[in-house]
Amino acid sequence: TPEVWVQVRMEATELSSFTIRCGFLGSGSISLVTVSWGGPNGAGGTTLAVLHPERGIRQWAPARQARWETQSSISLILEGSGASSPCANTTFCCKFASFPEGSWEACGSLPPSSDPGLSAPPTPAPILRAD
């Protein structure tokens, strides 16, 4: 069964800067990746970035840089201040779509006990939804 993992890290140099990394563990080609915060995409979450493997990348503040790391993983750097700044308990969600086969989504947040800049290696997160 395909799985999605999400890793959230606060940068030691900038406490208002977060790095979100997401990956897809499964076979099949990815047609779109959507990163959101505040909840799952389409269910109350706010879209931060959308990555298409061929047509490019779109991102919205406070997203600073979204990029593909591999064919099945992405990273997103967020920085903000004031109302647009993420906080330590913010939930980030990544959705990997493979049209028309299905989509898989998982969410994660900063580990409560983690120090800035330190985090455990990514582990598969529960699948919230699969079409």
């Epitope: 779109l32 979450g45 879209t47 959308v50 028309p100 989509s103």
Partner: nanobody, 120 residues
Framework: EVQLVESGGGLVQPGGSLRLSCAAS????????MGWFRQAPGKGLEGVAH???????RYVESVKGRFTISQDHAKNSLYLQMNSLRAEDTAVYYC??????????????WGQGTMVTVSS
């Protein structure tokens, strides 16, 4: 949870008409576009038509003048009126909502699909 449910597919003779409907529910935000893709037997996916957030409809060349896409915001529904149908229109038709990349509507969510068969 986002749900897109298509209906209106079926068997029709060449030159005939069909109207596909898509009922959307569970969305709490606006995407860039909503439209229809199709996949003919043994073929790849093709974007048929979509409506941008600005309300402008866009069509693939092969259906221009024959297909009309429309929305009913009050009913949260999308429609595809298909006239002068041809055998090459035979496909599974998917209702999609997605994000714009140029003139392309990249599917983020979609329905289960409805089969359209054009045959005499």
């Amino acid at each position: 949870e986002v749900q897109l449910v298509e209906s209106g597919g079926g068997l029709v003779q060449p030159g005939g008409s069909l109207r596909l409907s898509c009922a959307a529910s569970g969305y709490t935000f606006s995407t860039d576009c909503m439209g229809w893709f199709r996949q003919a037997p043994g073929k790849g996916l093709e974007g048929v038509a979509h409506i941008d957030s600005d309300g402008i409809p866009r069509y693939v060349e092969s259906v221009k003048g024959r297909f009309t896409i429309s929305q009913d915001h009050a009913k949260n529904s999308l429609y595809l009126q298909m006239n002068s149908l041809r055998a090459e229109d035979t496909a599974v038709y998917y209702c999609v909502v997605g994000f714009k990349f140029g003139d392309y509507c990249a599917p983020n969510d979609w329905g289960q699909g409805t089969m359209v068969t054009v045959s005499s």
